[in-house]
Amino acid sequence: EKLPKAPVITTPLETVDALVEEVATFMCAVESYPQPEISWTRNKILIKLFDTRYSIRENGQLLTILSVEDSDDGIYCCIANNGVGGAVESCGALQVKMKPKITRPPINVKIIEGLKAVLPCTTMGNPKPSVSWIKGDNALRENSRIAVLESGSLRIHNVQKEDAGQYRCVAKNSLGTAYSKLVKLEVEVFARILRAPESHNVTFGSFVTLRCTAIGIPVPTISWIENGNAVSSGSIQESVKDRVIDSRLQLFITKPGLYTCIATNKHGEKFSTAKAAATVSIAEWSKSQKDSQGYCAQYRGEVCDAVLAKDALVFFNTSYRDPEDAQELLIHTAWNELKAVSPLCRPAAEALLCNHLFQECSPGVVPTPMPICREYCLAVKELFCAKEWQAMEGKAHRGLYRSGMHLLPVPECSKLPSMHRDPTACTRLPYLDYKKENITTFPSITSSRPSADIPNLPASTSSFAVSPAYSMT
């Protein structure tokens, strides 16, 4: 009779390399008496006998993985036990080998010049594939701007026009090579002004041609603005060559003005804009103008930024030591006073105060401020802010305000020029043009004035996009 013998594994498990979808077999030869019970584990988890992905034969000595998957890699162990002595164990690794596979291929990309572009290329494979990129017909070289990331993705910093083209990624290991489909990188370029219009000082009645050249991808469109409004007279000629647009505005000069060239192009849902301005002043213009102590310049402050036309020149009164600062403080103080007024009144009052303290300016030989048109002042006083204005005047009469209306730097409407007499001699408030079309209920006006004085504002001569600050609740 045979003597009992503890199990001995005569053929230890070895590392097995297998390709995906192929068969992989581990052999665990055991000598023992009586016959041992052999169990198998993967990563220390028991493999169940009835798992159809495996075949266990030869009394458990042969484990076959019928169709290897990527997730099958790990440490496989056989454990033999027959009750004599201790159980014995042998382990080996399964290394799943895999041809390169691109799991997340690159896609077509539109990107704005100067931004960062990332073309994805996520791969699988064992050994881990190396990823390279091809642009057009040539291998892409990495440099300070262009890098292939650890993930395989291509990152291009500060994208340039010359980066545009067709790209594909290549994943390679010892078992083979995979190519992505060709994708297109399109580089869009913000509108940029190449040649700004030049300022002119001319005699009354002269012809002047202002020229503005812009570039961009897609090719920009050019529009012209005169003192904050669309150009109402003059002829425009345009030509396009090699993504460069050239626009020429010919004008007959009867008054000074600030002319702004605006180049715009579209990037998806967004627009990019570039601006350049030129002044046309009239020599000897001062003869018909009253002498004013001040200068014309752009507004640099914060408070009226959303109210004043972006490119407009405004008047700074040099009777103040620091005109910019003094006028900004006045408007800031006024702004705080306006916090208490109604949502109907506040934006109208803001438009009035900003345009009154920072009056549009004609930059002739003698800088001349352009006051607000009387009709717009009255619209604020008797329409938008009727209640507030009356309350303020009432408090002034009762001595609650020492200086009455002068607590706010409010213009005296009756002293302002009428737009019906000379539309070019005063400033409109575009906000009111826009808003009067949208007001369905007017505040009750109990005014001592004859009803004829309640303003009838003209139809707006230009479209005016209301700032979000002007939304009314």
Partner: antibody
Framework: ELQLVESGGGLVQPGGSLRLSCAAS????????MSWVRQAPGKGLEWVSA????????YYKESVKGRFTISRDNAKKTLYLQMNSLKSEDTAVYYC??????????????WGQGTLVTVSS | QAVVTQEPSLSVSPGGTVTLTCGLS?????????PDWYQQTPGQAPRGLIY???SRHSGVPSRFSGSISGNKAALTITGAQPEDEADYYC????????????FGGGTKLTVL
């Protein structure tokens, strides 16, 4: 005597962060706009950021937008510049400068002595 | 974006007059650019000289004057002194899509 004293500079690795401070004294801090201006070694001056007297708006040079944040604490008479995702090209002496008026933009009439920021691995 | 241009270097004899200019790569410098001028001597922080085209900062000698001439801003030093040897920077306010303050590359002035 009017004084602006910067601090917080030092050596930092690319991608790192620093917070610069500028302590003001000798003037009414909350009456003036402030700016940060930098100067790379051997190079010219470069405006970085500005803030008006009340902190109501902030303005930045295009290349630092989204990475740098200017702020001020008028009670502490201090101006700050929080710098994130630093790059080697941000290496410079950073000056804190006082505006001659309330608004953010305009002439800078007083400057600190600067603090050196070095971005290097 | 427009680049602010300055002469890289200039020289002047003591007592002489020199004009430094500040232009824009595209377009003209106007009062709306509020030209400012700064002086920086080696190892020192900059100091303001001229603001808003032609106003002198307090304590700045009257030999420094600012103007707009043609399509450029100009800083004129009349009766240059040895201590005027320094780097001079002009700065312009710009408004395109956002507000910016842009310095020129600087002019190295040598008083021979």
């Amino acid at each position: 005597e009017l004084q602006l004293v910067e601090s917080g500079g030092g050596l930092v690795q690319p991608g790192g962060s620093l917070r610069l401070s500028c302590a003001a004294s000798g003037f009414t801090f909350d009456d003036y706009g402030m700016s940060w201006v930098r100067q790379a070694p051997g190079k010219g001056l470069e405006w970085v950021s500005a803030i008006p007297w009340n902190g109501g708006s902030t303005y930045y040079k295009e290349s630092v937008k989204g990475r740098f944040t200017i702020s001020r604490d008028n009670a502490k008479k201090t101006l700050y510049l929080q710098m994130n995702s630093l790059k080697s090209e941000d290496t410079a002496v950073y000056y804190c400068a006082k505006r001659s008026g309330r608004i953010a933009f305009g002439a800078l009439d007083a400057w600190g002595q600067g603090t050196l920021v070095t971005v290097s691995s | 974006q427009a680049v602010v241009t300055q002469e890289p270097s200039l020289s002047v004899s003591p007592g002489g007059t020199v004009t430094l200019t500040c232009g824009l790569s595209s377009g003209s410098v106007t009062a709306s650019n509020y030209p400012d001028w700064y002086q920086q001597t080696p190892g020192q922080a900059p100091r303001g000289l001229i603001y808003s085209t032609d106003s002198r900062h307090s304590g700045v000698p009257s030999r420094f004057s600012g103007s707009i001439s043609g399509n450029k801003a100009a800083l004129t030093i009349t009766g240059a002194q040895p201590e005027d040897e320094a780097d001079y920077y002009c700065a312009l306010y710009m408004y395109s899509d956002s507000k910016l303050y842009v310095f020129g590359g600087g002019t190295k002035l040598t008083v021979l």
